[in-house]
């Protein structure tokens, strides 16, 4: 568990990808707020649950996202 | 391939102060999470701090709170450490590493380590 | 904090030899423990993460198990670069701890 801190947000490291799709189980998108001033992505791994921080500004993940998001909308009754 | 290259050690007195800098290149600097590890001679490793992808956050070992400081500047792809009021068992090699990042806030678990810089604290 | 014990603290072994290391934490870890290797006046080298991964370049006689607060690091056939010492460290939580380590020495 992350130490207590004044600042809260999540990620120490991002990655720029490239994730596949399927590999993610979830996808949270935290917007910027008091607490923690950037937009912080968090993408669950249906293999082992491992959790990985997604850079906001990579190409690859702004796609991963519209997908995710398109994806979701699809499903949606 | 991944460098990183740490100076600033050297021999300086009790209660004085030092800035410690790693170089870094090979990987994208600025995405990722830099550690500070020390080892005392013939001792074993101890993680001292870590910094963010982007500065925000730092943790610290209780051992030097309040003392160290660390700090990053990603124009300059640098990793520094700056340790103030410095005690004789802040004598070790200090390594910076890089965050393995698999934890979604930081693992704390290290791919790559720099050489080392030995500071010794003597009067 | 939580605390890794190492076992041995020091072994000798002979090149060919299947070398076995263990490591138990205070407390549950999950899988979140890294293996490193340190020879002498050089930085620690990563071998092993997240208890059974292989770091990439690291050799195939290096294997880890263990999950829950009881791993175990082996080399299946020791070979004359790998004396050296090897430290366990978990990554559950915050501050990251690491064992004592275990020197590996020619017999």
């Known amino acids: 568990i992350p130490l207590a801190r004044t600042v809260r947000c999540n990620c120490i490291h991002i990655d720029d990808g490239p994730v596949r799709m399927r590999a993610i189980g979830k996808l949270e998108i935290i917007p910027a707020s008091l607490s923690c001033p950037r937009v912080e992505i968090i993408a669950t791994m249906k293999k082992n649950d491992e959790q990985r921080c997604l850079n906001p500004e990579s190409k690859t993940i702004k796609n991963l996202m519209k997908a995710f998001s398109q994806k979701r909308s699809k499903r949606a009754p | 391939q991944v460098q990183l290259v740490e100076s600033g050690g050297g021999v300086v007195q009790p209660g004085r102060s030092l800035r410690l800098s790693c170089a870094a290149s090979g990987f994208t600097f600025s995405n990722s999470g830099m550690h500070w590890v020390r080892q005392a001679p013939g001792k074993g490793l101890e993680w001292v701090a870590v910094i963010d992808y982007d500065g925000i956050i730092q943790y610290y070992a209780d051992s030097v709170k309040g003392r160290f400081t660390i700090s990053r500047d990603n124009s300059k792809n640098t990793l520094y450490l700056q340790i103030n009021s410095l005690r004789a068992e802040d004598t070790a090699v200090y390594y910076c590493?890089?965050?393995?990042?698999?934890?979604?806030?930081?693992?704390?678990?290290?791919?790559?380590w720099g050489q080392g810089t030995l500071v010794t604290v003597s009067s | 904090d939580i605390q890794m014990t190492q076992s041995p603290s020091s072994l000798s072994a002979s090149v060919g030899d299947r070398v076995t290391i263990t490591c138990r934490a205070s407390q549950g870890i999950s899988s979140w423990l890294a293996w490193y290797q340190q020879k002498p006046e050089k930085a620690p080298k990563s071998l092993i993460y997240?208890?059974?991964s292989l770091q990439s370049g690291v050799p195939s006689r290096f294997s880890g198990s263990g999950s829950g607060t009881d791993f175990t690091l082996t080399i299946s056939s020791l070979q004359p670069e790998d004396f050296a010492t090897y430290y366990c460290q978990q990554y559950n939580s915050y501050p990251p701890t690491f064992g004592g380590g275990t020197k590996v020495e020619i017999k």
């Open positions: 590493a890089t965050e393995r990042g698999t934890h979604y806030y930081g693992s704390g678990s290290f791919d790559y």
């Open positions: 997240a208890a059974s």
